[in-house]
Interface confidence: low
């Protein structure tokens, strides 16, 4: 999936299986990513688990779990708030669109999380105070905290190179980046560009991610995924000058 | 160098109206161990910082004064001055305790927010 880190780095990651997205003293978010097509290096998020840790007089430990075709508006224990403590309402789940869009407010840690199902896959967005982001017990053992450190270099796909290549040669795929033998070859570059431009008029990294996804999968739902990801940035990012990213830094994670 | 953050966390863990860790309790040692851990985490960026080196020596002195072992539990991390779980004196304040921005505004203007997102393939 495409990852925008807490430090505004933008990466396309081929991480497969279960990976920690956030892991601090208050919250743990794990995603499970699966290949979008057989033989493809590109992966998308098929499962999301969020653990809100027991916190003082505010909330009991709560676990939220979403999977493909199952976006519940409740924690796994059936509740919609933080439990029985005095400040239980400082953690709340709100269903915005049934089965498609859920918002979790964790006021006790100043955090808002948006989870969506777009097409078959899940998207995740969070707004969190720096103090909470950095509240980790052991920096050394939490080296794979994706939102903070980014993806390991060997798990990154250079989708801008893919984009440049595709621009020059139609829908020919970069095998090294993301071979997708079963993707519909009939999806031309021009169509991908048109579809993405429709939803994402600014040619930023969200637009480029959209084009990459369409060429890789032939699934137009990924246009909406990029569109909603940008909408969530507009709602959640505190710096309105940084809504659109144009350069992807591919430096070492950390 | 984030030594001032370590100092303030230790201060808030060992002082204040609910005093979770008075000098003669195991909690005080736990708070000291947390303080030591905090200084170790920030060590790389604090070389030559006077406040850092005095904190490190101060911790060693306090550890030996109070017979604290180096290994053992650390105090539970807290956000700002939020009290420890189960502190009954603070129960009536729970709506504010459980509202990060309200408790933050007591200390500084507004928290710095960050964003992370994951989408697509």
């Amino acid at each position: 999936p495409h990852l925008r880190t807490f430090t505004d780095r933008f990466q396309t990651c081929k991480v497969q299986g279960a990976w920690p997205l956030i892991d601090n003293n208050y919250l743990n978010v794990q995603v499970t990513n699966t290949p979008v097509l057989p033989g493809s290096a590109a992966t998308a998020t098929s499962k999301l688990t969020i653990i809100f840790k027991n916190f003082q007089e505010c909330v009991d430990q709560k676990v939220y779990q979403a999977e493909m075709d199952e976006l519940p508006a409740a924690f796994v224990d059936g509740s919609k708030n933080g439990g029985d403590k005095h400040g239980a309402n400082s953690l709340k789940i709100t269903e915005k669109v049934s089965g498609q869009h859920v918002e979790i407010q964790a006021k006790y840690i100043g955090t808002t999380i948006v989870v969506r199902q777009v097409g078959r896959y899940l998207t995740f967005a969070v707004r969190m105070p720096e103090e909470v982001v950095n509240a980790v017990e052991d920096w050394d053992s939490q080296g794979l905290y994706l939102c903070l450190r980014g993806c390991p270099l060997n798990q990154q796909i250079d989708f801008q190179a893919f984009h440049t290549n595709a621009e020059g040669t139609g829908a020919r795929r970069l095998a090294a980046a993301s071979p997708a033998p079963t993707a519909p070859e009939t999806f031309p570059y021009e169509t991908a560009v048109a579809k993405c431009k429709e939803k994402l008029p600014v040619e930023d990294l969200y637009y480029q991610a959209c084009v990459f996804d369409l060429l890789t999968t032939g699934d137009v739902n990924f246009t909406l995924a990029a569109y909603y990801a940008l909408e969530d940035v507009k709602m959640l990012h505190s710096n309105k000058d940084k809504l659109h990213l144009y350069e992807r830094t591919r430096d070492l994670p950390g | 160098c984030k030594i001032l953050k370590c100092n303030s966390e230790f201060w808030s863990a060992t002082s204040g109206s609910h005093a979770p860790a008075s000098d003669d309790t195991p909690e005080f040692c736990a708070a000291l161990r947390s303080y030591a851990l905090c200084t170790r985490r920030t060590a790389r960026t604090c070389r030559g910082d006077l406040a850092y080196h005095s904190a490190v020596h101060g911790i060693e002195d306090l550890m030996s004064q109070h017979n604290c072992s180096k290994d053992g539990p650390t105090s539970q991390p807290r956000l700002r001055t939020l009290p420890p779980a189960g502190d009954s004196q603070e129960r009536s304040d729970s709506p504010e305790i459980c509202h990060y921005e309200k408790s933050f505004h007591k200390h500084s203007a507004t928290p710095n927010y960050t964003h992370c997102g994951l989408f697509g393939d």
Epitope: A18, I51, V63, Q65, V76, D77, G78, G83 | -
Partner: antibody, heavy 120, light 109 residues
Framework: EVQLVQSGAEVKKPGASVKVSCKAS????????ISWVRQAPGQGLDWMGW????????NYAQKLQGRVTMTTDTSTSTAYMELSSLRSEDTAVYYC?????????????WGQGTLVTVSS | QSALTQPRSVSGSPGQSVTISCTGT?????????VSWYQQHPGKAPKLMLY???KRPSGVPDRFSGSKSGNTASLTISGLQAEDEADYYC?????????FGGGTKVTVL
């Protein structure tokens, strides 16, 4: 003290069912999952599945799907594991364990185990 | 789904260090932060020794430590003691099933 206390040993015939109970105390029963793990004589540990006592959500090991049923009774803080169509290879000690922080994570408290013998 | 692979047995003298490996796939070990280790004495229930690869529950001596490299997680017991003689199991999660390793018998010579 957090404790899980299991029911006593059982002897069953092949084809029968067995229901093992696990009574929790010392913590809020609905705030943790319960996993079931079995261990055949002289063998290793074998995960059977998980249940959320609050919602009844379950996640069973693929090889036991259709034969295992996990339930809970929140009024008595008790979890149950029922295994049907028993065969001799189901002879094992069955453990319940509290799950530390979510369905698939670490098991921090274990019951004492219940020996189930399947023999004709 | 195959279990995680552990050596059948390891041994060491008191005071020595021993390391038990637990090898799986990228999804069961390599990409997972949720690897835990359990100690089991004969006739007893297992006991949690490490969780989330490296973390020690309270009450577990600090001579027990965990690490991970690639698709292999490891448990190290430094300063081996007589009471450490037991079976040790690793556990992780892959796909939809929780997996245990086959177990390693640690013998204190």
């Amino acid at each position: 003290e957090v404790q899980l206390v299991q029911s006593g040993a059982e002897v069953k015939k092949p084809g029968a069912s067995v229901k093992v109970s696990c009574k929790a105390s010392g913590y809020t029963f609905t705030s943790h999952g319960i996993s079931w793990v079995r261990q055949a004589p002289g063998q290793g540990l074998d995960w059977m599945g998980w249940i959320s006592p609050y919602s009844g959500n379950t996640n069973y090991a693929q090889k036991l799907q259709g034969r295992v049923t996990m339930t809970t009774d929140t009024s008595t803080s008790t979890a149950y594991m029922e295994l049907s169509s028993l065969r001799s290879e189901d002879t094992a000690v069955y453990y319940c364990a509290r799950v530390g922080s979510g369905p698939y994570y670490y098991m921090d408290v274990w019951g004492q185990g219940t020996l189930v013998t399947v023999s004709s | 789904q195959s279990a995680l692979t552990q050596p059948r047995s390891v041994s060491g003298s008191p005071g020595q260090s021993v390391t038990i490996s637990c090898t799986g796939t990228s999804s069961s070990v390599g990409d997972s932060i949720y690897v835990s280790w359990y100690q089991q004495h004969p006739g007893k229930a297992p006991k949690l020794m490490l969780y989330d690869v490296t973390k020690r529950p309270s009450g577990v001596p600090d001579r027990f430590s965990g690490s991970k490299s690639g698709n292999t997680a490891s448990l190290t017991i430094s300063g081996l003691q007589a009471e450490d003689e037991a079976d040790y199991y690793c556990k992780s999660y892959a796909g939809t099933d929780t997996l245990f390793g086959g177990g390693t018998k640690v013998t204190v010579l």
